[in-house]
């Protein structure tokens, strides 16, 4: 059985979101793929691959780059220089025609907030990491931090408690949260 869960990614302005969507090779290797944002009930296609898909031929639309790896059954999505208004729900889809698209797994809830200084992270850091918890703790929770922290095991009802110096976040009914560090 496949779990369909919404995944939450938190970033600061100026950083880069990098995600992947996997698909059944035998079914969709040669199909066009698209990256869409849900706006109300209507999805808006932001970028789509060429047809037929070819390895290492990235498609760039503004700040979005799609790279399909049909040999590997993966679509790579990169959104650079994230802005607060980019926040929202995103999906990878197999693009057949505008009115018919097959949604790939796990919609992504992107939350972009202003940096503490109100400026984007440095160019070196802004393209970096989706952080995960250390291997000694409950890594299924997602985040990896560069600053000291504790991560408590998620209780059965799926409330995640992530503690970082000077802050505590309680997340209820969110399967995972993946956070990048705040760059001051």
């Amino acid at each position: 059985t496949t779990e369909l869960t919404e995944e939450k990614y938190e970033y600061k302005e100026g950083q880069t979101l990098e995600v992947k969507c996997d698909y059944a090779l035998e079914k969709y290797a040669n199909s066009r793929k698209a990256w869409q944002k849900m706006e109300g009930k209507m999805p808006k296609i932001l970028a789509k691959t060429e047809r037929p898909s070819e390895n290492s031929h990235p498609v760039q639309v503004g700040r979005i780059t799609l790279e399909d790896y049909p040999d590997h059954g993966l679509l790579q999505v990169r959104m650079t220089n994230l802005q607060v208004e980019d926040s929202g729900l995103y999906q990878c889809v197999i693009y057949q025609h505008p009115k018919e698209s097959h949604v790939l797994f796990n919609p992504i809830c992107l939350v972009v907030t202003k940096g503490s200084s109100g400026t984007p992270g440095s160019s070196e850091n802004s393209t970096q990491n989706v952080y995960r918890t250390p291997s000694t703790t409950a890594k299924a929770l997602g985040p990896r931090y560069t600053s000291p922290r504790t991560v408590t095991q998620a209780p059965p009802e799926s409330t995640v408690v992530v503690s970082t110096p000077g802050s505590e976040i309680n997340l209820t009914n969110v399967t995972d949260i993946i956070r990048v560090p705040v760059f001051n």
Partner: antibody
Framework: QVQLVQSGAEVKKPGASVKVSCKAS????????INWVRQATGQGLEWMGW????????GQTQKFRGRVTMTRNTSINTAYMELSSLRSEDTAVYYC???????????????WGRGTLVTVSS | DIQMTQSPSSLSASVGDRVTITCQAS??????LNWYQQKPGKAPKLLIY???NLETGVPSSFSGSGCGTDFTFTISSLQPEDIATYFC?????????FGGGTKVEIE
């Protein structure tokens, strides 16, 4: 305890198949990719491919396409890698390794099995 | 495929020495570079991810730097327990590729 436990060493004849298992424990199996990496004696590391335990989707490098099959059984948190049409140059240690979160473009392997030695000899 | 060229392939140094290993990618890999340590008969162990981030529990004597195509891994003060082979790995593009490894020995 967070770990990946692999099946034991195998000796196979050329042309045969081998199936290596990798049992995950201590974390949510379906949330992280499982990758397979092999290493011939005294050689470097070679990535073979990946498995998303949640969707069951897989991908392999071109070198192994058609010869390798990656599967999983989520009820027992176990991933499998089957390599067919074995030849002597497939003699190697085969590792399973946990990759990044299934939806993240984060391919670092922070948890490894101990490896399974597969010897192909007539 | 992206080629990862590691050098030197082996080195010998004294306890307390500073040891540097380089890894060169055949194209820009956008800081998608990791470093692993492998001791004889053992599985590799992740030390550094994304160029310079230390994996939890890894001593601060290990560090990484670089950008674009050229990356460096440093052991600030070599200890007997650091005897191992070190590998770099890129993940900017598929297939994932590793460097050939650098075997570090004590003089």
């Amino acid at each position: 305890q967070v770990q990946l436990v692999q099946s034991g060493a195998e000796v196979k004849k050329p042309g045969a198949s081998v199936k290596v298992s990798c049992k995950a424990s201590g974390y949510t199996f379906t949330r992280y990719d499982i990758n397979w990496v092999r290493q011939a004696t005294g050689q470097g590391l070679e990535w073979m491919g990946w498995l998303n335990p949640n969707s069951g989707n897989t991908g392999q490098t071109q070198k192994f396409r058609g010869r390798v099959t990656m599967t999983r059984n989520t009820s027992i948190n176990t991933a499998y890698m089957e390599l067919s049409s074995l030849r002597s140059e497939d003699t190697a240690v085969y590792y399973c390794a946990r990759g990044g979160y299934t939806s993240a473009w984060r391919w670092y392997f922070d948890l490894w099995g101990r490896g399974t030695l597969v010897t192909v000899s007539s | 495929d992206i080629q990862m060229t590691q050098s030197p392939s082996s080195l010998s140094a004294s306890v307390g020495d500073r040891v540097t290993i380089t890894c060169q990618a055949s194209q820009d890999i956008n800081n998608h570079l990791n470093w692993y340590q492998q001791k004889p008969g053992k599985a590799p162990k992740l030390l550094i991810y994304d160029v310079s981030n230390l994996e939890t529990g890894v001593p601060s004597s290990f560090s990484g730097s670089g950008c674009g195509t050229d990356f460096t891994f440093t052991i600030s003060s070599l200890q007997p327990e650091d005897i191992a082979t070190y590998f770099c790995q890129q993940y900017d593009k598929l297939p994932l590729t590793f460097g050939g490894g650098t075997k570090v020995e004590i003089e």
